[in-house]
Interface confidence: medium
């Protein structure tokens, strides 16, 4: 219960704080747990006890290991234990999962993601920002204090947010960098009766003979990641693939989120050399969800080639 | 009549990895497949789910990255494979589809397979 578990990067400040809380008038005794042996006080040390605070500066990965801290008052004493681990900077930018402090939501109304751990540090702003290992740059992201403000979240702001700043201790620096996960959750996700925004209602698509033609279904579906929704084609009634006509194929496009939020999905039909009797067919674009099912028909007709030299 | 069987839950301990399958029977055509759950006293919730048309998958952000959703046209099969399991994920695991059945579009759901995740 009174362990606390602490990490951190060789040659970085790193500053673990005794889990058991006293009044700041009681004296606190660090150890270091395999040993017994006492940690120094004095300042000169790279790894010396301040209070309530066992500071590393830097931290080595031989560090590493269970300190003890013993809060110690006129009528008790309380034992507490900082389980220390000091890793190797990796090489690449992935951050492993042991590295990570606790993830953090974020949605359109609140987006503060704050650095982990940064209050028992001496750091003066601006603090820096990654996102992926990536500087974050743009008027949408503002480091404010101790956190990151993300204007606008969208779901593509989602990933592992890296701060770091800079630690002073008697004129010295130290690096310190730390980083959590965020997700975004949709606050206003809703999902709804499909709404066909393409083609129109009983709409006259103009093609071709002997040309290829590309026919669009589009539909929305609701504002947020839309689960089960469908977008497709019918050839008189009759689904494609069993149409049996091999010229007349439909293929998954692009998805799309619309900057009102939509979450859309569109099928494209493709015909390859117009023939006359594919005027003669009805062509239905279908969206379905768990609401149900929205039909817009559309019918082809005949494009008289235009004569440029009339 | 549309069937849709689901398999792969048991209890698995925390960090560990089950896949769910689900199968749809007396369809002629799935259009597009997904895992919901549902823990004790929850909302149901959306896992992930994937078109058959394009294979686009969807996921729930608390799964992504450790669950991946896939599926056999052939078969008319969804796999959900879960990885990284954590206790929160402990649910019912419901399958669902829009599929045509018989000239009729529809969507349906299976009786579910409950996944425990525990030490």
């Known amino acids: 219960k009174f362990s606390k578990q602490s990490w951190g990067l060789e040659n970085e400040a790193l500053i673990v704080r005794c889990p058991r809380q006293g009044k700041p008038s009681y004296t606190v005794d660090w150890y270091y747990s395999q040993t017994n042996k006492s940690i120094p006080t004095q300042e000169r040390n790279r790894v010396f006890a301040s209070g309530q605070l066992l500071k590393f500066l830097p931290a080595a990965v031989a560090d590493s290991g269970i300190y003890t801290c013993i809060v110690r008052s006129p009528t008790f004493n309380r034992t507490g234990y900082a389980n220390v681990t000091i890793y190797k900077k990796q090489s690449d930018c992935n951050v492993p999962d042991y590295l990570m402090y606790s993830t953090v939501s974020g949605s359109e109304k609140n987006s503060k993601i704050y650095c982990p751990t940064i209050d028992l540090y001496n750091w003066t702003a601006p603090l820096e920002w990654f996102k992926n290992c990536q500087a974050l740059q743009g008027s949408r992201y503002r480091a404010h204090k101790s956190f990151l403000v993300i204007d606008n979240v969208m779901t593509e702001d989602a990933g592992d947010y890296t701060c770091k700043f800079i630690h002073n201790e008697n004129g010295a620096n130290y690096s310190v960098t730390a980083t959590r996960s965020f997700t975004v959750k949709d606050e206003q996700g809703f999902s709804l009766f499909p709404v066909i925004g393409a083609p129109a209602q009983n709409e006259i698509k103009e093609v071709e003979i002997g040309k290829n033609a590309n026919l669009t279904c589009s539909a929305c579906f609701g504002k947020g990641t839309q689960f089960l929704a469908a977008v497709l084609w019918q050839l008189n009634g009759t689904k494609i693939t069993d149409f049996g006509e091999p010229r007349i194929q439909q293929e998954e496009g692009q998805n799309q989120s619309f900057s009102n939020g939509l979450a859309c999905l569109d099928m494209v039909l493709r015909i390859a050399d117009v023939k006359e009797e594919d005027l003669l067919l009805q062509y239905d674009c279908l969206a379905l969800n768990l609401h149900g099912l929205r039909r817009h028909t559309v019918r082809l007709s005949r494009k008289n080639p235009i004569d440029h030299h009339s | 009549e549309v069937q849709l069987v689901e398999s792969g839950g048991g209890l698995v301990q925390p960090g560990g990895s089950l896949r769910l399958s689900c199968a749809a029977s007396g369809l002629t055509t799935v259009y597009t497949m997904g895992w919901f759950r549902q823990a004790p006293g929850k909302e149901r919730e959306s896992v992930a789910s994937?078109?058959?048309?394009?294979?686009?998958?969807y996921y729930a952000d608390s799964v992504k990255g450790r669950f991946t959703i896939s599926a056999d046209n052939s078969k008319n099969t969804a796999y959900l494979q879960m990885n990284s399991l954590k206790p929160e994920d402990t649910a019912v695991y419901y399958c669902a589809a829009i599929a045509h059945e018989e000239g009729v579009y529809r969507w349906d759901w299976g009786q579910g397979t409950l996944v425990t995740v525990s030490s």
């Open positions: 994937i078109s058959w048309t394009g294979g686009t998958t």
